[in-house]
Interface confidence: low
Protein backbone atom coordinates (compact mmCIF):
# COMPACT_ATOMS: atom_id res chain seq x y z
CA UNK A 1 0.00 0.00 0.00
CA UNK A 2 1.41 3.39 -1.04
CA UNK A 3 0.49 5.82 1.73
CA UNK A 4 2.59 8.73 0.55
CA UNK A 5 1.61 10.64 -2.60
CA UNK A 6 2.69 8.90 -5.77
CA UNK A 7 4.24 12.17 -6.95
CA UNK A 8 3.88 15.92 -6.81
CA UNK A 9 2.65 18.84 -8.86
CA UNK A 10 4.89 21.88 -9.12
CA UNK A 11 4.25 24.65 -8.35
CA UNK A 12 2.33 23.45 -5.33
CA UNK A 13 0.47 26.73 -4.76
CA UNK A 14 -0.01 28.18 -8.23
CA UNK A 15 -1.27 31.73 -8.58
CA UNK A 16 -1.53 33.04 -12.12
CA UNK A 17 -2.20 36.49 -13.50
CA UNK A 18 -5.56 36.36 -15.23
CA UNK A 19 -5.21 36.19 -18.99
CA UNK A 20 -1.66 34.84 -18.88
CA UNK A 21 -0.24 31.39 -19.64
CA UNK A 22 0.68 28.82 -17.02
CA UNK A 23 2.60 25.55 -17.01
CA UNK A 24 2.58 22.92 -14.26
CA UNK A 25 4.56 19.70 -14.03
CA UNK A 26 3.75 16.40 -12.37
CA UNK A 27 6.71 14.33 -11.23
CA UNK A 28 6.10 10.66 -10.39
CA UNK A 29 8.17 8.95 -7.73
CA UNK A 30 10.32 6.04 -8.81
CA UNK A 31 8.54 3.74 -6.33
CA UNK A 32 5.23 4.66 -7.89
CA UNK A 33 6.44 3.85 -11.40
CA UNK A 34 7.46 0.39 -10.24
CA UNK A 35 4.39 -0.23 -8.08
CA UNK A 36 1.90 0.58 -10.83
CA UNK A 37 4.05 -0.41 -13.84
CA UNK A 38 3.60 3.06 -15.36
CA UNK A 39 5.59 6.03 -16.63
CA UNK A 40 4.73 9.67 -17.30
CA UNK A 41 2.92 8.82 -20.53
CA UNK A 42 0.21 7.22 -18.36
CA UNK A 43 -0.53 10.56 -16.68
CA UNK A 44 -3.98 12.10 -17.18
CA UNK A 45 -4.33 15.76 -16.18
CA UNK A 46 -7.73 17.00 -15.03
CA UNK A 47 -9.20 20.40 -14.24
CA UNK A 48 -12.29 20.35 -12.03
CA UNK A 49 -12.59 16.61 -12.76
CA UNK A 50 -12.57 17.06 -16.57
CA UNK A 51 -9.69 15.60 -18.59
CA UNK A 52 -7.32 18.14 -20.12
CA UNK A 53 -6.94 17.79 -23.93
CA UNK A 54 -3.79 15.85 -24.91
CA UNK A 55 -2.47 18.74 -27.01
CA UNK A 56 -1.95 20.73 -23.80
CA UNK A 57 0.16 17.92 -22.29
CA UNK A 58 3.84 17.15 -22.86
CA UNK A 59 5.69 14.07 -21.63
CA UNK A 60 9.11 15.40 -20.64
CA UNK A 61 10.69 12.11 -19.54
CA UNK A 62 9.65 8.83 -17.94
CA UNK A 63 8.80 10.47 -14.60
CA UNK A 64 7.59 13.92 -15.64
CA UNK A 65 4.63 15.34 -17.55
CA UNK A 66 3.73 19.00 -18.04
CA UNK A 67 0.46 20.74 -18.81
CA UNK A 68 0.08 24.25 -20.26
CA UNK A 69 -2.92 26.54 -20.01
CA UNK A 70 -3.26 29.64 -22.14
CA UNK A 71 -5.28 32.72 -21.25
CA UNK A 72 -6.22 31.57 -17.75
CA UNK A 73 -9.50 33.22 -16.73
CA UNK A 74 -11.24 31.03 -14.14
CA UNK A 75 -10.69 32.38 -10.61
CA UNK A 76 -10.13 28.92 -9.11
CA UNK A 77 -9.41 25.56 -10.72
CA UNK A 78 -8.76 22.16 -9.13
CA UNK A 79 -5.83 20.70 -11.06
CA UNK A 80 -5.06 17.04 -10.57
CA UNK A 81 -2.44 14.66 -11.87
CA UNK A 82 -3.69 11.10 -12.24
CA UNK A 83 -2.30 7.85 -13.60
CA UNK A 84 -4.05 5.15 -15.56
CA UNK A 85 -2.92 1.90 -14.01
CA UNK A 86 -3.93 -1.76 -14.18
CA UNK A 87 -6.75 -2.01 -16.70
CA UNK A 88 -7.40 1.73 -16.99
CA UNK A 89 -8.06 2.29 -13.28
CA UNK A 90 -7.44 5.95 -12.55
CA UNK A 91 -5.33 6.71 -9.47
CA UNK A 92 -4.99 10.25 -8.17
CA UNK A 93 -1.35 11.26 -7.78
CA UNK A 94 -1.61 14.81 -6.52
CA UNK A 95 -3.89 17.83 -6.67
CA UNK A 96 -3.49 21.58 -6.32
CA UNK A 97 -5.79 24.58 -6.50
CA UNK A 98 -4.80 27.02 -9.22
CA UNK A 99 -5.90 30.58 -8.46
CA UNK A 100 -5.98 33.44 -10.93
CA UNK A 101 -6.36 37.16 -10.48
CA UNK A 102 -4.51 40.43 -10.72
CA UNK A 103 -1.74 42.12 -8.78
CA UNK A 104 -3.06 44.97 -6.65
CA UNK A 105 -3.52 48.39 -8.19
CA UNK A 106 -1.77 51.31 -6.61
CA UNK A 107 -4.25 52.57 -3.96
CA UNK A 108 -5.42 56.13 -4.62
CA UNK A 109 -7.34 58.95 -2.94
CA UNK A 110 -5.92 58.26 0.52
CA UNK A 111 -7.54 60.53 3.13
CA UNK A 112 -7.54 60.53 6.92
CA UNK A 113 -9.73 62.06 9.61
CA UNK A 114 -9.00 62.28 13.34
CA UNK A 115 -11.66 61.61 15.95
CA UNK A 116 -10.45 63.93 18.68
CA UNK A 117 -8.88 62.14 21.63
CA UNK A 118 -9.70 58.72 20.17
CA UNK A 119 -8.19 57.50 16.93
CA UNK A 120 -7.63 58.19 13.25
CA UNK A 121 -9.53 56.68 10.33
CA UNK A 122 -7.91 56.53 6.91
CA UNK A 123 -9.71 55.54 3.71
CA UNK A 124 -8.58 54.87 0.15
CA UNK A 125 -9.64 53.52 -3.22
CA UNK A 126 -8.04 50.08 -3.77
CA UNK A 127 -8.65 50.09 -7.54
CA UNK A 128 -9.85 47.09 -9.50
CA UNK A 129 -10.87 43.79 -7.97
CA UNK A 130 -7.90 41.43 -7.67
CA UNK A 131 -9.90 38.17 -7.25
CA UNK A 132 -7.16 37.08 -4.82
CA UNK A 133 -6.62 37.43 -1.10
CA UNK A 134 -5.06 40.90 -0.93
CA UNK A 135 -3.72 42.47 2.26
CA UNK A 136 -3.90 46.23 2.75
CA UNK A 137 -1.69 47.75 5.42
CA UNK A 138 -1.76 51.38 6.51
CA UNK A 139 1.78 52.49 7.34
CA UNK A 140 2.75 55.70 9.12
CA UNK A 141 5.87 57.35 10.45
CA UNK A 142 7.36 60.69 11.24
CA UNK A 143 10.88 62.00 11.58
CA UNK A 144 11.77 60.07 14.72
CA UNK A 145 9.22 57.31 15.05
CA UNK A 146 7.55 54.45 13.19
CA UNK A 147 3.93 53.99 14.22
CA UNK A 148 2.28 50.55 14.47
CA UNK A 149 0.94 49.14 11.21
CA UNK A 150 -2.80 49.00 10.71
CA UNK A 151 -4.10 45.88 8.96
CA UNK A 152 -7.24 46.65 7.00
CA UNK A 153 -10.14 44.24 7.40
CA UNK A 154 -12.10 45.52 4.41
CA UNK A 155 -9.38 46.68 2.03
CA UNK A 156 -10.67 50.24 1.81
CA UNK A 157 -10.12 51.73 5.29
CA UNK A 158 -8.26 51.31 8.55
CA UNK A 159 -8.76 52.70 12.05
CA UNK A 160 -5.34 53.24 13.61
CA UNK A 161 -4.89 52.03 17.16
CA UNK A 162 -2.68 54.91 18.29
CA UNK A 163 -3.63 58.51 18.93
CA UNK A 164 -1.55 60.57 16.49
CA UNK A 165 0.62 63.34 17.89
CA UNK A 166 -0.53 66.86 17.06
CA UNK A 167 1.68 69.61 15.68
CA UNK A 168 4.09 67.30 13.89
CA UNK A 169 3.75 66.22 10.29
CA UNK A 170 3.21 62.50 9.91
CA UNK A 171 3.56 60.49 6.73
CA UNK A 172 0.90 57.94 5.88
CA UNK A 173 0.61 55.48 3.00
CA UNK A 174 -1.12 52.21 2.15
CA UNK A 175 0.58 49.03 0.99
CA UNK A 176 -1.33 46.44 -0.99
CA UNK A 177 0.06 42.93 -1.38
CA UNK A 178 -1.08 39.63 -2.83
CA UNK A 179 0.61 36.62 -4.39
CA UNK A 180 1.16 38.53 -7.64
CA UNK A 181 2.71 41.71 -6.34
CA UNK A 182 3.12 44.49 -3.83
CA UNK A 183 2.60 48.21 -4.34
CA UNK A 184 1.94 51.30 -2.26
CA UNK A 185 -0.08 54.44 -2.57
CA UNK A 186 1.66 57.74 -2.72
CA UNK A 187 2.35 59.02 0.77
CA UNK A 188 0.39 61.88 2.26
CA UNK A 189 1.97 64.24 4.79
CA UNK A 190 -0.11 66.18 7.27
CA UNK A 191 -0.38 67.46 10.83
CA UNK A 192 -3.13 65.38 12.48
CA UNK A 193 -4.48 68.52 14.15
CA UNK A 194 -5.56 69.68 10.68
CA UNK A 195 -7.63 66.52 10.20
CA UNK A 196 -9.70 66.68 13.38
CA UNK A 197 -13.36 65.98 12.66
CA UNK A 198 -15.62 68.64 14.19
CA UNK A 199 -17.69 67.12 16.99
Amino acid sequence: QLLEPCGYIYPEFPVVQRGSNFTAICVLKEACLQHYYVNASYIVWKTNHAAVPREQVTVINRTTSSVTFTDVVLPSVQLTCNILSFGQIEQNVYGVTMLSGFPPDKPTNLTCIVNEGKNMLCQWDPGRETYLETNYTLKSEWATEKFPDCQSKHGTSCMVSYMPTYYVNIEVWVEAENALGKVSSESINFDPVDKVKPT
Epitope: E177, K182, S184
Partner: nanobody, 124 residues
Framework: QVQLQESGGGLVQPGGSLRLSCAAS?????TYWMYWVRQAPGKGPEW???????????YYADSVKGRFTISRDNAKNTVYLQMNSLKPEDTAVYYC?????????????????TGQGTQVTVSS
Protein backbone atom coordinates in the same frame (compact mmCIF):
# COMPACT_ATOMS: atom_id res chain seq x y z
CA GLN B 1 20.18 69.90 -11.59
CA VAL B 2 18.75 66.72 -10.04
CA GLN B 3 21.46 64.10 -9.62
CA LEU B 4 22.15 60.83 -7.81
CA GLN B 5 25.79 59.81 -7.49
CA GLU B 6 26.64 56.24 -6.46
CA SER B 7 29.99 55.26 -4.95
CA GLY B 8 31.66 52.59 -2.81
CA GLY B 9 31.82 49.71 -5.28
CA GLY B 10 34.88 47.62 -5.89
CA LEU B 11 36.39 44.14 -6.08
CA VAL B 12 35.80 41.96 -3.05
CA GLN B 13 36.25 38.28 -2.22
CA PRO B 14 33.24 36.01 -1.56
CA GLY B 15 32.09 36.48 2.03
CA GLY B 16 33.40 40.04 2.10
CA SER B 17 31.59 43.32 2.68
CA LEU B 18 31.10 46.66 0.92
CA ARG B 19 29.17 49.81 1.75
CA LEU B 20 27.63 51.70 -1.14
CA SER B 21 26.62 55.34 -0.90
CA CYS B 22 24.28 57.42 -3.00
CA ALA B 23 24.49 61.18 -2.66
CA ALA B 24 21.58 63.28 -3.89
CA SER B 25 21.94 66.81 -5.18
CA UNK B 26 19.45 69.22 -6.69
CA UNK B 27 16.52 67.88 -4.65
CA UNK B 28 15.58 66.99 -1.08
CA UNK B 29 16.13 63.28 -0.51
CA UNK B 30 13.69 63.13 2.40
CA THR B 31 10.71 63.67 0.09
CA TYR B 32 11.36 60.43 -1.81
CA TRP B 33 11.46 56.70 -1.25
CA MET B 34 14.91 55.49 -2.23
CA TYR B 35 15.89 52.25 -3.97
CA TRP B 36 18.89 50.23 -4.93
CA VAL B 37 18.64 48.39 -8.24
CA ARG B 38 21.36 46.27 -9.81
CA GLN B 39 22.13 45.06 -13.29
CA ALA B 40 24.44 42.13 -13.97
CA PRO B 41 26.20 41.79 -17.34
CA GLY B 42 23.76 40.65 -20.02
CA LYS B 43 20.80 40.63 -17.62
CA GLY B 44 17.85 42.90 -16.95
CA PRO B 45 17.71 45.24 -13.96
CA GLU B 46 16.88 43.63 -10.60
CA TRP B 47 15.25 45.43 -7.69
CA UNK B 48 17.40 45.01 -4.56
CA UNK B 49 16.09 47.16 -1.74
CA UNK B 50 13.93 50.13 -0.77
CA UNK B 51 13.69 52.50 2.18
CA UNK B 52 10.81 54.81 3.15
CA UNK B 53 11.16 58.56 3.45
CA UNK B 54 11.73 58.51 7.19
CA UNK B 55 13.91 55.41 6.97
CA UNK B 56 11.83 53.20 9.26
CA UNK B 57 10.38 50.89 6.63
CA UNK B 58 12.85 48.83 4.62
CA TYR B 59 12.33 46.15 2.00
CA TYR B 60 14.63 43.60 0.40
CA ALA B 61 14.61 41.19 -2.51
CA ASP B 62 14.66 37.57 -1.33
CA SER B 63 18.11 37.12 -2.88
CA VAL B 64 19.70 39.66 -0.50
CA LYS B 65 17.51 39.37 2.61
CA GLY B 66 19.59 38.97 5.77
CA ARG B 67 22.81 40.04 4.02
CA PHE B 68 22.12 43.60 2.82
CA THR B 69 20.94 46.58 4.87
CA ILE B 70 19.57 49.79 3.38
CA SER B 71 19.63 53.02 5.38
CA ARG B 72 19.50 56.74 4.81
CA ASP B 73 20.74 59.95 6.37
CA ASN B 74 18.35 62.67 5.28
CA ALA B 75 20.48 65.37 6.89
CA LYS B 76 23.35 64.35 4.60
CA ASN B 77 21.03 63.73 1.62
CA THR B 78 22.56 60.23 1.31
CA VAL B 79 21.28 56.66 1.13
CA TYR B 80 23.47 53.63 1.90
CA LEU B 81 23.56 49.92 1.13
CA GLN B 82 25.61 47.80 3.51
CA MET B 83 26.40 44.52 1.75
CA ASN B 84 27.70 41.61 3.85
CA SER B 85 28.42 37.95 3.03
CA LEU B 86 28.80 38.85 -0.63
CA LYS B 87 28.43 36.12 -3.25
CA PRO B 88 29.68 35.94 -6.85
CA GLU B 89 26.04 36.30 -8.00
CA ASP B 90 25.96 39.76 -6.39
CA THR B 91 28.35 40.96 -9.10
CA ALA B 92 26.61 43.82 -10.94
CA VAL B 93 26.45 47.55 -11.43
CA TYR B 94 24.44 49.03 -8.55
CA TYR B 95 22.25 52.09 -9.08
CA CYS B 96 20.19 54.15 -6.69
CA UNK B 97 16.80 55.49 -7.72
CA UNK B 98 14.05 57.60 -6.19
CA UNK B 99 10.26 57.44 -6.26
CA UNK B 100 7.28 59.09 -4.62
CA UNK B 101 5.99 55.69 -3.46
CA UNK B 102 7.00 52.10 -2.80
CA UNK B 103 6.90 49.45 -5.50
CA UNK B 104 7.98 45.86 -4.97
CA UNK B 105 8.70 45.66 -8.65
CA UNK B 106 8.30 42.21 -10.23
CA UNK B 107 11.36 41.18 -12.29
CA UNK B 108 9.90 42.26 -15.64
CA UNK B 109 8.80 45.69 -14.42
CA UNK B 110 11.97 47.14 -12.91
CA UNK B 111 12.62 50.50 -14.57
CA UNK B 112 15.86 50.72 -16.54
CA UNK B 113 18.40 52.46 -14.33
CA THR B 114 20.01 55.69 -15.47
CA GLY B 115 23.22 57.30 -14.32
CA GLN B 116 26.70 55.94 -13.72
CA GLY B 117 26.10 53.36 -11.04
CA THR B 118 28.92 51.72 -9.11
CA GLN B 119 30.47 48.39 -10.10
CA VAL B 120 30.54 45.60 -7.52
CA THR B 121 32.62 42.53 -8.40
CA VAL B 122 32.68 39.51 -6.12
CA SER B 123 35.43 37.12 -7.11
CA SER B 124 38.25 35.13 -5.59
Amino acid sequence: QVQLQESGGGLVQPGGSLRLSCAASGFTLSTYWMYWVRQAPGKGPEWVSAVSRGGFNTYYADSVKGRFTISRDNAKNTVYLQMNSLKPEDTAVYYCMSSVSFYGWPPDRVPSPTGQGTQVTVSS
